[in-house]
């Protein structure tokens, strides 16, 4: 057998088993698992006298290694004294020594609970530059404890952590905080908080969760857009699965219909996101009539690391219907931007919230990328509203100064569309917007209100107006805010819109 250094263990009695009037007491030290012979055991008894006896070594049958016990008997004021057993094993090394310091007896104690907590990620699921690990050592009988942090089983520098102890009633708690750089945390190492107490070791370990554990995988199922449903007459629905860990098993998306009828062939797309997660979309064509008649479609998401399948279903929105009101406006010319103009379209008081917005010029639909449309928001009443914004160039309005904002919505009649035309220069083009004069006062609609009155002339505040409180001397509904134009103007001029 090769040379093996001993493991050393203190041998003590339970304090409650020692009579209070005992004048002497015996304690011991076990050295085990060493090879070859011998070990030398010496005792430090402090100020007390003691007699020692080392028992002959015995052979451990399985390994052929040795074990021996040394006993120390002390008399006098032993209860307050600490004793050190020093074991030397020269075959391991000329200076191989293991010291164990302990008292005569062990008291009953409540062991600690050890738990590591970790600081949060930011809102986007990303780790901050430093990560804090908090080791909570709680509920133990007060006494000396030693906390060591390990990285993959190797001792970490004590100066990287801070510790504090509190006592509540008869029990104590200690917490140790370790600060790590993001680089170390992300390197997939295991961090252990190791607590030594009353000769026992307690620990808890943690590491960055493996990417194979889906971080809150979510699934969403969209309804067909009104444009696809009523204009193109080729509606599709999309099942979107986000926050998947890449390349860790296949995600399956399965379509079905509540009626049990067969579904069409779907198309699938996978996209790696910048945060390292995978997004999977499956698009299913549905029948226009099936959808309008209220068929329910289901998307079932399965993945090896999901505890159970995710089910999402969609169907035509129920509830009251209301057609949209459409208002289109052109903003006045802005100094330095003579060759560009912004058109705005307020579409409001429609139900349900599904709506498609298009802009047309010269009877041709402009690409969706040309305009920006908000998500439907609830009005103060029961309907919804959206704003759509389109930038047009001088070349376009000089070719034909009429732009159309069209809303596609199931409640609009006769053909599920409502549209309004707007001109950049209404005076020249004879359009329906107001004539352009320098304003001295502007009326703005507060963004929190239900919507604009039907007679409103616009929805975008004059670029140089600022919002004031509603004024009693100004005509209009009380919920409208007043904006005062800073530049001088010759005649009163009103503009109603969002501040």
């Amino acid at each position: 057998a090769s040379t093996q250094s001993p493991s050393v263990f203190p041998l003590t009695r339970c304090c409650k088993n020692i009579p209070s009037n005992a004048t002497s007491v015996t304690l011991g030290c076990l050295a085990t698992g060493y090879f070859p012979e011998p070990v030398m055991v010496t005792w430090d008894t402090g100020s007390l006298n003691g007699t020692t006896m080392t028992l002959p070594a015995t052979t451990l049958t399985l390994s052929g290694h040795y074990a021996t016990i040394s006993l120390l008997t002390v008399s006098g004021a032993w209860a307050k004294q600490m004793f050190t057993c020093r074991v030397a094993h020269t075959p391991s090394s000329t200076d191989w020594v293991d010291n164990k310091t302990f008292s005569v007896c062990s008291r009953d104690f409540t062991p600690p609970t050890v738990k590591i907590l970790q600081s949060s990620c930011d809102g986007g699921g990303h780790f901050p530059p430093t990560i804090q690990l908090l080791c909570l050592v709680s509920g133990y009988t007060p006494g000396t404890i030693n906390i060591t942090w390990l990285e993959d089983g190797q001792v970490m520098d004590v100066d990287l952590s801070t510790a504090s102890t509190t006592q509540e009633g008869e029990l104590a708690s200690t917490q140790s905080e370790l600060t790590l750089s993001q680089k170390h945390w992300l390197s997939d190492r295991t961090y252990t908080c190791q607590v030594t107490y009353q000769g026992h070791t307690f620990e808890d370990s943690t590491k960055k969760c493996a990417d194979s554990n889906p971080r809150g995988v979510s699934a969403y199922l969209s309804r067909p857009s009104p444009f696809d449903l009523f204009i193109r007459k080729s509606p599709t629905i999309t099942c979107l699965v986000v926050d998947l860990a890449p390349s860790k098993g296949t995600v399956n998306l399965t379509w079905s219909r509540a009626s049990g009828k067969p579904v069409n062939h779907s198309t699938r797309k996978e996209e790696k996101q910048r945060n390292g997660t995978l997004t999977v979309t499956s698009t299913l064509p549905v029948g226009t009539r099936d959808w309008i008649e209220g068929e329910t479609y289901q998307c079932r998401v399965t993945h090896p690391h999901l505890p159970r399948a995710l089910m999402r279903s969609t169907t035509k929105t129920s509830g009251p219907r209301a057609a949209p009101e459409v208002y289109a406006f052109a903003t006045p010319e802005w100094p330095g931007s003579r060759d560009k103009r912004t058109l705005a379209c307020l579409i409001q008081n429609f139900m349900p919230e599904d709506i498609s917005v298009q802009w047309l010029h010269n009877e041709v639909q402009l690409p969706d990328a040309r305009h920006s449309t908000t998500q439907p928001r609830k009005t103060k009443g029961s309907g919804f509203f959206v704003f759509s914004r389109l930038e047009v160039t001088r070349a376009e309005w000089e070719q034909k100064d009429e732009f159309i904002c069209r809303a596609v919505h199931e409640a609009a009649s006769p053909s599920q569309t409502v549209q309004r035309a707007v001109s950049v220069n209404p005076g020249l083009a004879g359009g329906s917007a107001q004539s352009q004069r320098a304003p001295d006062r502007v009326l703005c609609h507060s963004g929190q209100q239900q919507g604009l009155p039907r007679a409103a002339g616009g929805s975008v505040p004059h670029p140089r107006c600022h919002c004031g409180a509603g004024r009693a001397d100004w005509p209009g509904p009380p919920e409208l805010d007043v904006c005062v134009e800073e530049a001088e103007g010759e005649a009163p001029w009103t503009w109603t819109g969002l501040c």
């Epitope: 020594v97 060591t148 390990l150 990285e151 993959d152 089983g153 190797q154 001792v155 990287l160 790590l180």
Partner: antibody
């Protein structure tokens, strides 16, 4: 007290193999990583790599991948550095150094083993 | 790899002098820089860790400062036994690298 005791000097020929030992005492061997550092005659210190004494996993600097191998004999609290196919440029003093994780603090060093490679 | 540039290469001082040894990193390494002393025919000895944290058993005349990429080891009042080579070491980025050293001599 913590002590790292390295084996004695070695004189080798090119192409031979050398195995240096580093025996640790005064602490729990498997709790601390062990680094190996090379110092060529009259030169500075060059980190070769380290071995996790708990898992046995070795990490090498780019320059020391291939002919160099770290190993352990945990029962004897000893770490080893083996250099195969020795070259003249391996002539140096090799130090073992105990490490505090995770920022490579080398708090205790062995006395060094001088390896001379000469034909 | 991060390069550490130490200056001066050699420093000749009189006992009692206050000296400063510089170490510059090729990129920021926060405070993860350690200093070692190596006397002739001896192994290196840890003097300072994390740029400024003192080590038990090291005389108080040794101190460190700096963060980012510029670091300084100061010896308040040089003693004759301080002769040797002083190395800085990057502990921040893999692999750990050492500076070429500053040799301290006594006039």
């Amino acid at each position: 007290q913590v002590k790292l005791q390295e084996s004695g000097p070695e004189l080798k020929k090119p192409g031979e193999t050398v195995k240096i030992s580093c025996k640790a005492s005064g602490y729990t061997f498997t709790n601390y990583g062990m680094n190996w550092v090379k110092q060529a005659p009259g030169k500075g210190l060059k980190w070769m790599g380290w071995i996790n004494t708990n898992t046995g996993e070795s990490t090498y600097a780019e320059e020391f991948k291939g002919r160099f191998a770290f190993s352990l004999e945990t029962s004897a609290s000893t770490a080893y550095l083996q250099i195969n196919n020795l070259k003249n440029e391996d002539t140096a003093t090799y130090f073992c150094a105990r490490e505090l994780r995770p920022y490579h603090v080398m708090d205790y060093w062995g006395q060094g083993t001088t390896v001379t490679v000469s034909s | 790899d991060i390069e550490l540039t130490q200056s001066p290469a050699t420093l000749s001082v009189t006992p009692g002098d206050r000296v400063s040894l510089s170490c510059r990193a090729s990129q920021s390494i926060s405070v993860y820089l350690h200093w070692y002393q190596q006397k002739s025919h001896e192994s290196p000895r840890l003097l300072i860790k994390y740029a400024s944290q003192s080590i038990s058993g090291i005389p108080s005349r040794f101190s460190g400062s700096g963060s980012g990429s510029d670091f300084t080891l100061s010896i308040n009042s040089v003693e004759p036994e301080d002769v040797g080579v002083y190395y800085c070491q990057n502990g921040h980025s893999f692999p750990p690298t050492f500076g070429a050293g500053t040799k301290l001599e006594i006039k």
